[in-house]
Structures are given as structure tokens and as C-alpha cells.
């Protein structure tokens, strides 16, 4: 058993049929010695008396809010949560496996630049009685500070018969140099509590590996005289690290119709313009990627050919 | 310890070209190592990230773009002294800071070159003959060093009398390639910045 926060405790349980469970001793936070009784949740049934209560925690029915009273007055609470371990593996029931970039990916993180600011998100099908808390650091043995905000519900989607909820959190490394060469990864830890179930999820990464620039901005087309070709130009996204001559981007320019199966024109360039062949009903799209360290491509910025 | 915005310098172009080749060569070699040593811990997640130049050179700080010198977090520089004459610097007006930056890059390359050559000598003794260093990568390191053209003491190649542990050597190769790729990215950024300045 360990303390998650004041008056909230996590009991770690090996979860298998007829498991013996864990013996837990609760102590009432009071100077009083006599006349103390214990109850669980909203029940008025007295579970025991005295300053301490010893319980055998085996299942969710044994978890919950234990309260000690004296003469009708509440003295203190202890909330017990369960953390299940099945076949030596901690449960991951609360969050959905996003399977990208690999299986057992519950947290996904992205950074728009090298400033040390990043966003992580996760998915769940649970809509109520759910809380998250996020901690982060650079390195684990001698951790350096990363400050994270509160996790918020950022999107709701319908997937077949199920509703899916996306939560996200923004974090900022306390003293980040955009030009630094990272040798210690960022660690992100998410505590998830659903009713009386506790789970924790972690992710470890270098900012350089989670870079995904915003799409290029200000796409413009200039038809070339006596030609089917157009010159397309664009600018670096505002959110990208500066100076741009140091933090350079490379671009992919594509002309395609509405369907992915349609024929297309595609060219890669380090410049902020390119010449492509435009077709009726097609659109020109441009995306960006760090020129020197190949992490993710940005989403496409698009303009119609016509 | 930073790069002022200098006058356009035709002498930077060869260094830019060589640094681009360097990044391509090390990235290619790292990819090859990851594929060949698929049953060794050779991915970024699996290896320890070591920097053999730590406390010996200060490339990131010495080559910091002017725009980032206002960032307190970028200025925890380590003081290191370097020789200052180089052929990438065509202009007499080249700043002392730029020379410091380029000589730091030169020292990095020299250290990695020695490590790689020592390692390759060991890998050539491996009866499995599983992986060797790409001669192209070694040649590109050499070309960039020549383009930088700094005079510096030659570092003797490490020789080892004991029987090499090939497993450890291959893991060390992965560690070295990952670190060198990161440094090659920095070098490429610096050359691009200097070229545009």
C-alpha cells in the first residue's frame, strides 16, 4: 500500500481467483483513543472499533472510502483504490491502446517545435467517475523539471456503437534550450482513477523524436505563362523554432484529386516554393518536416488548383 | 560563445555540402546497424545515450545562433579553448566566435574518427564478420575535417591488446552512431545557419 495523495491510498493486488489479497491497517487521524468506530462509503454498518482497523483487501468491494467517527462526528477519511496485477502485468483497462507507433501505446505525445513544450493525449471509452493526474520530468534518476497543466477532455468521437473520449495535457520543460542535444529522455507519468480502480501509464521520449511541425502557412498559387505548370509558394508555420536557417524544414508538395487512388504529381524541396502540374478538380497540398532529423511530417496545408 | 550574424561567406559552401553528406552517411550507417544488429539493443529506446565529446568540446554552446543567446537555458557553456584558423572561413573578418565554433566541430570529428577507426579494427577481427563501418562515412568525416582545415594535435589511435568482446563492441557501435548522428544534425544546422548569415 502507498499514498497517492493525502488520504488516498493505492493497494496493489495480485489478481487471480482465490488470491489472498493484502492485509491493510488503517489508522484514524485523531488524538482520540476511545469510542472510535469505522464505516465504509455510505453504509452505516460498523466495521470495527478502535483507533486502527485491520482489513483484508481482496476485491473492489473491499475498496472505497473508510471513515472513522466518534459520537456521530467524522474524524478522518481514507480512500482505498485498487491497482490490479494480472500474470505479473499491471492492468490497463482505463485507457485504450492506440497501437501507433506500436502496440501498447496508451499515451501519445507531440511537439510543434524545440521549445520544450509538448502535448500528450490518450483515449478512453469511460465517460464518468474518471480523474487523471500528470507528472513529467527530464530523466528519472536525477530528474529535471517539467511542468504539466491539468488534463482536459479535448475531443469526443463516435466509434461504431461506442463513444470515445480524448484527453490531453500540455507540458513545458522548465529550462529548455531549443538547440540542445538531448541525452536524457522526457518521462511522462499519468495516474488514472476510474471509480475505485487505479492505473498508471508512462511514456518516455526525446523531444526530437516527437516533433511534428504545424502545416506550412500562406499557400499561394501563381500560374506560369503558356504552361500547365503553377508555382506554389508558402511560408514556415509561426509555431516553428527560429532562426529558420538553423531549424530548417523540408517540404513535400503534392497535387492530387479527391480520391487517394487518383494520379498525382509530387515533389520534395527545401525551398518555400515549387513548380507543379495542376489539374482540374485537384488540389495542391504542402507539408513540412524537420530537414535534418526525420521525425513526423506535418498535416497537409491545401489550396484548390482552380 | 555564439555565432554573430556574419557577412555572406563563399568559404562556407564546401562545409555545408560536406556536412550534409556527413549526416546522410551517418544516418545511413545507423540504419544499416539497426537492421544488421536487429537482435542487439541498437534502437534509440534501448541504448544508453553517451556523448564522447562531453566536457572536451562545446559545439552546441560555441555554435549557438545569435537569436538563441537571449535564452538563459542555452548559456550554461563549458569553457574550452580551441585553435583558430580554418579554411571554411574565407573572410578575414570572420569572428573569433565562429572560429571557436568551427574548431569545436573539428575536434568532435577528430574524436569520432579515432573511435570509429579503433572500433572498425575490432570489428574486422570478428569471425562472424557481421558489420563493418561504411568506408564512405569515414571518408566523409575526413572530407569535412579537411574542409575545416584546423591544425591540431593528432590523437593516437587506441590499440588494445586484450581479446575484443564483439558483443560489447557492437553495442558500443550503436551508442556511438546514435550520438554521432545527433552531433551531425547539430553540425548541419550550424553550417546551414552560417551559410544563410
Amino acid at each position: 500500500i502507498w499514498e497517492l495523495k493525502k488520504d488516498v491510498y493505492v493497494v496493489e493486488l495480485d489478481w487471480y481467483p482465490d488470491a489472498p489479497g493484502e492485509m491493510v491497517v488503517l489508522t484514524c487521524d485523531t488524538p482520540e483513543e476511545d469510542g472510535i468506530t469505522w464505516t465504509l462509503d455510505q453504509s452505516s454498518e460498523v466495521l470495527g472499533s478502535g483507533k486502527t482497523l485491520t482489513i483484508q483487501v481482496k476485491e473492489f468491494g473491499d475498496a472505497g472510502q473508510y471513515t472513522c467517527h466518534k459520537g456521530g462526528e467524522v474524524l478522518s477519511h481514507s480512500l482505498l483504490l485498487l491497482h490490479k496485477k494480472e500474470d505479473g502485468i499491471w492492468s490497463t483497462d482505463i485507457l485504450k491502446d492506440q497501437k501507433e507507433p506500436k502496440n501498447k501505446t496508451f499515451l501519445r505525445c507531440e511537439a510543434k517545435n524545440y521549445s520544450g513544450r509538448f502535448t500528450c493525449w490518450w483515449l478512453t471509452t469511460i465517460s464518468t467517475d474518471l480523474t487523471f493526474s500528470v507528472k513529467s520530468s527530464r530523466g528519472s534518476s536525477d530528474p529535471q523539471g517539467v511542468t504539466c497543466g491539468a488534463a482536459t477532455l479535448s475531443a469526443e468521437r463516435v466509434r461504431g456503437d461506442n463513444k470515445e473520449y480524448e484527453y490531453s495535457v500540455e507540458c513545458q520543460e522548465d529550462s529548455a534550450c531549443p538547440a540542445a542535444e538531448e541525452s536524457l529522455p522526457i518521462e511522462v507519468m499519468v495516474d488514472a482513477v476510474h471509480k475505485l480502480k487505479y492505473e498508471n501509464y508512462t511514456s518516455s521520449f526525446f523531444i526530437r523524436d516527437i516533433i511534428k511541425p504545424d502545416p506550412p502557412k500562406n499557400l499561394q498559387l501563381k500560374p506560369l505563362k503558356n504552361s500547365r505548370q503553377v508555382e506554389v509558394s508558402w511560408e514556415y508555420p509561426d509555431t516553428w523554432s527560429t532562426p529558420h536557417s538553423y531549424f530548417s524544414l523540408t517540404f513535400c508538395v503534392q497535387v492530387q484529386g479527391k480520391s487517394k487512388r487518383e494520379k498525382k504529381d509530387r515533389v520534395f524541396t527545401d525551398k518555400t516554393s515549387a513548380t507543379v502540374i495542376c489539374r482540374k478538380n485537384a488540389s495542391i497540398s504542402v507539408r513540412a518536416q524537420d530537414r535534418y532529423y526525420s521525425s513526423s511530417w506535418s498535416e497537409w496545408a491545401s489550396v484548390p488548383c482552380s | 560563445r555564439n555565432l554573430p550574424v556574419a557577412t555572406p561567406d563563399p568559404g562556407m559552401f564546401p562545409c555545408l555540402h560536406h556536412s550534409q553528406n556527413l549526416l546522410r552517411a551517418v544516418s545511413n550507417m545507423l540504419q544499416k546497424a539497426r537492421q544488421t544488429l536487429e537482435f542487439y539493443p541498437c534502437t534509440s529506446e534501448e541504448i544508453d545515450h553517451e556523448d564522447i565529446t562531453k566536457d572536451k568540446t562545446s559545439t552546441v554552446e560555441a555554435c549557438l545562433p545569435l537569436e538563441l543567446t537571449k535564452n538563459e537555458s542555452c548559456l550554461n557553456s563549458r569553457e574550452t579553448s580551441f585553435i583558430t584558423n580554418g579554411s571554411c572561413l574565407a573572410s578575414r573578418k570572420t569572428s573569433f566566435m565562429m572560429a571557436l565554433c568551427l574548431s569545436s566541430i573539428y575536434e568532435d570529428l577528430k574524436m569520432y574518427q579515432v573511435e570509429f577507426k579503433t572500433m572498425n579494427a575490432k570489428l574486422l577481427m570478428d569471425p562472424k564478420r557481421q558489420i563493418f563501418l561504411d568506408q564512405n562515412m569515414l571518408a566523409v568525416i575526413d572530407e569535412l575535417m579537411q574542409a575545416l582545415n584546423f591544425n591540431s594535435e593528432t590523437v593516437p589511435q587506441k590499440s588494445s591488446l586484450e581479446e575484443p568482446d564483439f558483443y560489447k563492441t557492437k553495442i558500443k557501435l550503436c551508442i556511438l552512431l546514435h550520438a554521432f548522428r545527433i552531433r551531425a544534425v547539430t553540425i548541419d544546422r550550424v553550417m546551414s545557419y552560417l551559410n544563410a548569415s
Partner: antibody, heavy 118, light 107 residues
């Protein structure tokens, strides 16, 4: 299966014209760009140009402007290359290509050998 | 027009050798470079697109890398079926152009 059937080898007199054909099977040429590439005996490859059969748009390499004319007939699923004022320099194998992407060649025909005699 | 220079013109190798073929562009072409193999009396076939992207059905011993002006096609452990000519082609701008080719022959 995506395939390109090119017309047979031809021997033509200097100064004459010739029209080569390239018939597609397994796909509709409207969904592809069609290119023509020239290869002279024991030499490299030269790009002649492309046509978009969907709308008839064409682009030629400057060297072949006036020498080559590309057309396409979507009803017969065939692309054509007409070469005019033939000289010995035009003796070559001519390949047609069907490309989902405009700028590289993923489906090649077997080629048509054209020999120009004086 | 963009000129592509391939080297060497001829490469004599023994099956099992690993080889690198070079293609250099007269100006920077990013990664807009593709590699083709042409065996005797056959049409060319696409091996690698955009400098390093593999093509389905092409053996994994073929790999490409490079960007800007310098490109390399590597064949890891040459097999007898690999002998023939290799061409690079740029798609950075029109007109599309090819290199003169490298002939890979049996030593």
C-alpha cells in the same frame, strides 16, 4: 495485371513519319499519366514527354518539341507517339510508360524498335 | 536542364560482393531521384523512388540514400541476376533527365 502492349518493330525511310501505339490492359489510361522514353542503341534514356489522357494535356522535353506528338484515345485505351521528319538520330527503342505519379516511371512497355534507313 | 553524372561507368564484381553506385546532380534536387535497373534486351524497372523509398517486389538488398546533389544505390551482396545497367533519374524539374548509367558486369 497492369500491362502495356506496344506496336511492333518498324523500318522506315529517312524523312518519313511514324506513329507508335501503346495499348493498356488491366487499367484505364485516364487514371494514369502516359510517358514516352527514347533509348538509342547502347545508350542512355531520354524522356520525350507526357500526356494526360483524361484531358489531352501534354508536356514535351524541349529537344522533342516539333519532333514528337503525343495523343491518346481513351475509347481504345491507347496512347500514341508520332515522330516526324525521321533521321538516323531517331533510330532507337521507344518505351511507353503508365504512371500513377507524374515524375517517375513504374510501369514500362516492352518497347518498340524504330530503325530509320537512308 | 539538370545533368546527372553516374560513376563508375562500369563496375566489375563477383557475386556476393557489396557495391555502391553513385549519381551526382548538377544542382540540388532534394530527394527527387529514382533508380532503375535494365537487364540486357529488357525494359528498365523501377528499383528505388525518392532517393531511398523501397518499391514492392524489389529485393531488400537494393537500397538508396542521398539528397541534394549526391546519391548512392547500394546492392548488398550482388546476385547473378543483378548484372545489367543502372540508371538514375531526377524528377525535381522538367525536362525529366536520366544519368548515362552504370554497367554492372561479372568480374
Amino acid at each position: 495485371e497492369v500491362q502495356l502492349q506496344q506496336s511492333g518493330a518498324d523500318l522506315v525511310r529517312s524523312g518519313a513519319s511514324i506513329k507508335l501505339s501503346c495499348t493498356a490492359s488491366g487499367f484505364n489510361i485516364k487514371d494514369y499519366y502516359m510517358h514516352w522514353v527514347k533509348q538509342r542503341p547502347e545508350q542512355g534514356l531520354e524522356w520525350i514527354g507526357w500526356i494526360d489522357p483524361e484531358n489531352g494535356d501534354t508536356e514535351y522535353a524541349p529537344k522533342f518539341q516539333g519532333k514528337a506528338t503525343m495523343t491518346a484515345d481513351t475509347s481504345s485505351n491507347t496512347a500514341y507517339l508520332q515522330l516526324s521528319s525521321l533521321t538516323s538520330e531517331d533510330t532507337a527503342v521507344y518505351y511507353c510508360n503508365a504512371c500513377k505519379e507524374l515524375r517517375y516511371f513504374d510501369v514500362w512497355g516492352a518497347g518498340t524498335t524504330v530503325t530509320v534507313s537512308s | 536542364d539538370i545533368v546527372l553524372t553516374q560513376s563508375p561507368a562500369t563496375l566489375s564484381v563477383t557475386p556476393g560482393d557489396s557495391v555502391s553506385l553513385s549519381c551526382r546532380a548538377s544542382q540540388s534536387i532534394s530527394i527527387n531521384l529514382h533508380w532503375y535497373q535494365q537487364k540486357s534486351h529488357e525494359s528498365p524497372r523501377l528499383l528505388i523512388k525518392f532517393a531511398s523509398q523501397s518499391i514492392s517486389g524489389i529485393p531488400s538488398r537494393f537500397s538508396g540514400y542521398g539528397s541534394g546533389t549526391d546519391f548512392t544505390l547500394s546492392i548488398n551482396s550482388v546476385e547473378t541476376e543483378d548484372f545489367g545497367r543502372y540508371f538514375c533519374q531526377q524528377s525535381n524539374s522538367f525536362p525529366l533527365t536520366f544519368g548515362a548509367g552504370t554497367k554492372l558486369e561479372l568480374k
